[in-house]
Interface confidence: low
């Protein structure tokens, strides 16, 4: 069973008194409806809480909302509803918080049916003051901030107009009509799709993709016959209808849509979909749905141009368009991703890759766990992780897997141990090495969060009964202490800690229920006195990431380099602190076949590092479309992993020969593209 409060556990002394002095209760003086919480800025301590209560009447819905503000990480809250003139705020738009530490907040108000436009409340001083602004349109979406300039906002209206503000929502201008989808790109560029005839739905597959780089003064049509578009890393993707039939293909651009290439991916039919699972400036993980209602598809990984793709994983679970996938980027270790596959017998299994999609394996069975009823061989099985799909299926999984970039190597997730994901009640497992090895951390489902860059893990049991106990660990989940934070149990609804896992404060949210009323209540616990001293050099130890064979000179090499980290010793009870920066030492590796993905038309047989030709493509010349010209690829089956930094060693050659033939792409070629000005 999981380690608990036994003799071997390094217990924290006098923790009850220390935590009791740092536990702050706040009862919200309103009826329990819904509550949403937003952090304003980083390390500011400012939290906004919006509570809303709906009373459905015969003719209309009467709504009431209250706004609260904390500037001490949730220990105390002040009712600031009067700053928004006691207006009912539309929760479906949430609180639009500005990027970085801009201190900007936009709240969208509910207005009566006959009004000319909507209403927003704007703050640019971390919600100390708000300005009411009446809009010349009714917003359909939340206000979207430009990532480069928080004064620039865009919004779509209920009439499908694209509206832009250049002065943080003070004045608005409609820059285009008949807009379906709009997104900020880099350098304050806006990409959007428009319809010419009926509507977004009717014109799906016949939309135009437009771009404006000057907030609507001038436009450029960068694509036609568009079904949808997306941005990922430095890539712009568009799915484009084929000329001949109802299929569509992905086209990709790395220059903001000036030039396009056809991605070497299968085309999809009407019922299928593409999905960008993850993207960075180096490469893309793309899911391509299988024909029919199978609930699965194939993951492909791109080259550094987003054009040539390799098959990465078959039978990848992804239910329907906009449905559920378990694909998870493990942010605590470079190159690691976890997802689920649907096996032939319809069971769901978890797979993990440590090399950015090059190879996938099952998760190693935790040493302190037995195989469950799904296992055919009781001694050989794997850990299977519950993620979005399990949550959507209403399994007893309160949280998705958790990892944080500054808590190096730590991954926490619900799981079961067997041949497939089990419908039985899951337990919580932890990995301290980015997913290579796992340990059962807690019995039964829990909510969990990481504080102080991994120095503290906090958990609360998932129960239908009122709770008053929180668990915490200072040694990466090996040993647990329990703290009763209130005498009067509450119906627990959620844990909240500042994004980024640097804080030492945790807020426990819930409600109390008496005969006639129920009220929101929060308990904020500051763990600063548990971690009494600042960590020193002696508290850290050197850890080589991705290490599987210390005898091997190339041990730890992933994407052509290895990284040594300074990590907090499990036995050290000290503060990493808010300013903690992960210390890592990279070193370049010699190239091996592991640094190369299999090229298009090639695959790696299981347990083999060599790439072999896919039988169905044997003898076919590989031709693909690049910048509107047909190219011919001569390959020996390998291509370097995007972002791979290896030098020397093995170097399989790959060349691209230009056939100088025009592509039969149905996409606008650059010379046909037109510019327009307002």
């Amino acid at each position: 069973s999981a380690p608990g409060e036994d003799e071997e556990c390094g217990r924290v002394r006098d923790f009850v008194a220390k935590l009791a002095n740092n536990t702050h209760q706040h009862v919200f003086d309103d009826l329990r409806g819904s509550v949403s919480l937003s952090w304003v800025g980083d390390s500011t301590g400012v939290i906004l809480v919006l509570t809303t209560f709906h009373v459905p009447l015969v003719i209309m819905t009467f709504g009431q909302s209250k706004l609260y503000r904390s500037e001490d990480y949730g220990k105390n809250f002040k009712d600031i509803t009067d700053l928004i003139n006691n207006t009912f705020i539309r929760t479906e738009f949430g609180m639009a918080i500005g990027p970085e530490n801009s201190g900007k907040v936009v709240l969208t108000a509910e207005v009566s049916g006959g009004s000319r436009g909507g209403r927003i409340f704007r703050s640019s001083d971390f919600a100390k003051n708000f300005v009411q602004t009446d809009l010349p349109f009714h917003p359909l979406t939340q206000m979207m901030y430009s990532p480069q300039n928080s004064d620039y906002l865009l919004a779509l209206s209920t009439e499908n107009g694209l509206w832009v503000s250049k002065n943080f929502g003070g004045k608005w201008e409609e820059i285009h009509k008949a807009v379906c989808l709009a997104k900020w790109g880099s350098d304050n560029t806006i990409f959007f799709t428009t319809y010419a005839n009926g509507s977004c739905k009717a014109d799906l597959g016949a939309l135009e993709l437009w771009r404006t780089s000057d907030l609507g003064k001038s436009f450029k049509t960068i694509g036609v016959k568009i079904y949808s578009f997306g941005l990922g890393g430095r890539f712009l993707f568009a799915s484009v209808m084929a000329d001949k039939d109802t299929t569509r293909r992905i086209h990709v651009s790395t220059d903001q849509g000036d030039t396009w290439s056809m991605a070497q991916l299968p085309s999809v039919g009407q019922e299928q979909f593409y999905s960008i699972l993850a993207a960075n400036d180096d490469m893309v993980f793309m899911h391509v749905d299988e024909p029919g209602d199978t609930g699965f598809g194939t993951i492909f990984t791109s080259d550094d141009r987003g054009i040539v793709y390799s098959k990465s994983l078959d039978r990848h679970l992804y239910t329907t368009t906009g449905g559920e996938t378990d694909f998870t980027n493990v942010t605590s270790l470079r190159g690691v991703y976890i997802t689920s596959v649907l096996s032939e017998d319809n069971s769901i299994q978890t797979m993990i890759t440590f090399d950015q999609g090059g190879r996938w394996t099952h998760l190693r069975k935790p040493e302190n766990s037995e195989c469950d009823a799904t296992a055919k061989n009781k001694n050989e099985c794997s850990l299977h992780i519950h993620a979005s799909y399990s949550i959507s299926q209403k399994l007893n999984v309160p949280m998705a897997p958790l990892s944080e970039p500054n808590a190096v190597g730590i991954v926490i997730a619900h799981g079961s141990v067997g041949d497939a994901i089990s419908v039985m009640v899951p337990d919580v497992y932890i990995s301290d090495d980015g997913g290579y090895s796992w340990t059962k951390m807690l019995e039964g489902p829990h909510y969990y969060t990481i504080l102080d860059s991994g120095g503290i893990i906090v958990a609360i049991e998932h129960s239908s009964r009122p709770i008053n106990v929180i668990k915490f660990s200072t040694d990466e989940g090996q040993c647990w202490q329990t703290y009763t934070f209130t005498r009067d149990p509450i119906y627990f609804t959620g844990l909240a800690s500042e994004p980024g896992a640097r804080s030492m404060n945790i807020s426990i949210w819930g409600f109390t229920e008496s005969f006639l009323t129920s009220q929101w209540v929060s308990y904020t616990i500051d763990f600063k006195d548990i971690l009494e001293r600042n960590c020193e050099e002696k508290d850290y130890t050197i850890w080589l990431a991705h290490s599987t064979d210390p005898e091997d000179y190339e041990d730890g090499c992933i994407a052509g380099y290895k990284e040594q980290f300074l990590r907090l010793r499990k036995s050290s009870v000290c503060q990493n602190g808010r300013d903690y920066v992960v210390t890592k030492q990279p070193s370049i590796c010699l190239c091996s076949l592991e640094d190369f993905l299999c090229d298009f038309g090639y695959y790696r047989p299981e347990n083999d590092s060599k790439c072999v030709e896919q039988p169905e493509l044997k003898g076919h010349d590989l031709e693909f479309c690049l910048y509107g010209r047909e190219e011919h690829l001569t390959t020996n089956g390998y291509r370097k992993i995007p972002g791979d930094k290896c030098q020397g060693g093995v170097n399989p050659v790959r060349e691209v020969k230009d056939l100088k033939k025009k592509c039969t792409s149905n996409f606008l070629s650059p010379e046909k593209q037109n510019s327009k000005s307002n």
């Epitope: 609930g295 319809n346 009823a373 419908v423 009640v425 489902p445 998932h462 239908s464």
Partner: antibody, heavy 129, light 107 residues
Framework: QVQLVQSGAEVKKPGASVKVSCKAS????????MSWVRQAPGQGLEWMGI????????SYAQKFQGRVTMTRDTSTSTVYMELSSLRSEDTAVYYC??????????????????????WGQGTTVTVSS | EIVMTQSPATLSVSPGERATLSCRAS??????LAWYQQKPGQAPRLLIY???TRATGIPARFSGSGSGTEFTLTISSLQSEDFAVYYC?????????FGGGTKVEIK
């Protein structure tokens, strides 16, 4: 009201297969799992396995692995249990039972087990040469 | 698999008296335990879930307690309709397993 209606009694020869159906009504079929439990004459209850009506994923007791197949038809809200290579000791009453097994009831989801709260009337299967 | 052991196998009690049935698990099942009542020729009926919560429509004379490996079903004052066989069942770890049953008969 919520009910599970099972197919009628069956008499089978050793080595044959039997397929028992269980039709659910009165609730959202895909919102709860379905377990199968059997009871030999004069004996206690024995759990055979469980099926998730949403994806059709199953978990069987080791004893029945390889002999039992549980399937579902969401269009008719019916689950099926097929037991093959029948032997005389498979003579029993077979029950389907709605099993929340980790699915939350109203309110916050729970790690507490809600129990098999609705049972079919049972299907008697007799295996005899 | 987790083995559930019920005791006693048979319990003879007079109407109006208190009946205490015991169920022991071979390893911790936390609170993932249910109790069922079965009368001859009928399907089992859920009495208690989560070790201690009465199912809908179950009279207050039935109560469950325990956690981990030791569990008890108590019938505070036996009525004539309570004479039946009672089973405990764990749902902590697959496969689900039942106890062998306790028959409560009229003394």
């Amino acid at each position: 009201q919520v009910q599970l209606v099972q197919s009628g009694a069956e008499v089978k020869k050793p080595g044959a297969s039997v397929k028992v159906s269980c039709k659910a009504s009165g609730y959202t079929f895909t919102s709860r799992y379905m377990s199968w439990v059997r009871q030999a004459p004069g004996q206690g209850l024995e759990w055979m396995g469980i099926i998730n009506p949403v994806g059709g994923s199953t978990s069987y007791a080791q004893k029945f692995q390889g002999r039992v197949t549980m399937t579902r038809d969401t269009s008719t809200s019916t689950v099926y249990m097929e037991l093959s290579s029948l032997r005389s000791e498979d003579t029993a009453v077979y029950y389907c039972a709605r099993d929340p097994s980790g699915i939350a009831a109203a309110g916050p989801a729970s790690r507490y087990y809600y129990g098999m709260d609705v049972w079919g009337q049972g299907t008697t299967v007799t295996v005899s040469s | 698999e987790i083995v559930m052991t019920q005791s006693p196998a048979t319990l003879s009690v007079s109407p109006g008296e208190r009946a205490t049935l015991s169920c022991r698990a071979s390893q911790s099942v936390s609170s993932n335990l249910a109790w069922y009542q079965q009368k001859p020729g009928q399907a089992p009926r859920l009495l208690i879930y989560g070790a201690s919560t009465r199912a809908t429509g179950i009279p207050a004379r039935f109560s469950g307690s325990g956690s981990g490996t030791e569990f008890t079903l108590t019938i505070s004052s036996l009525q004539s309709e309570d004479f039946a066989v009672y089973y405990c069942q764990q749902a902590r770890l697959g496969p689900w397993t039942f106890g062998g049953g306790t028959k409560v008969e009229i003394k």
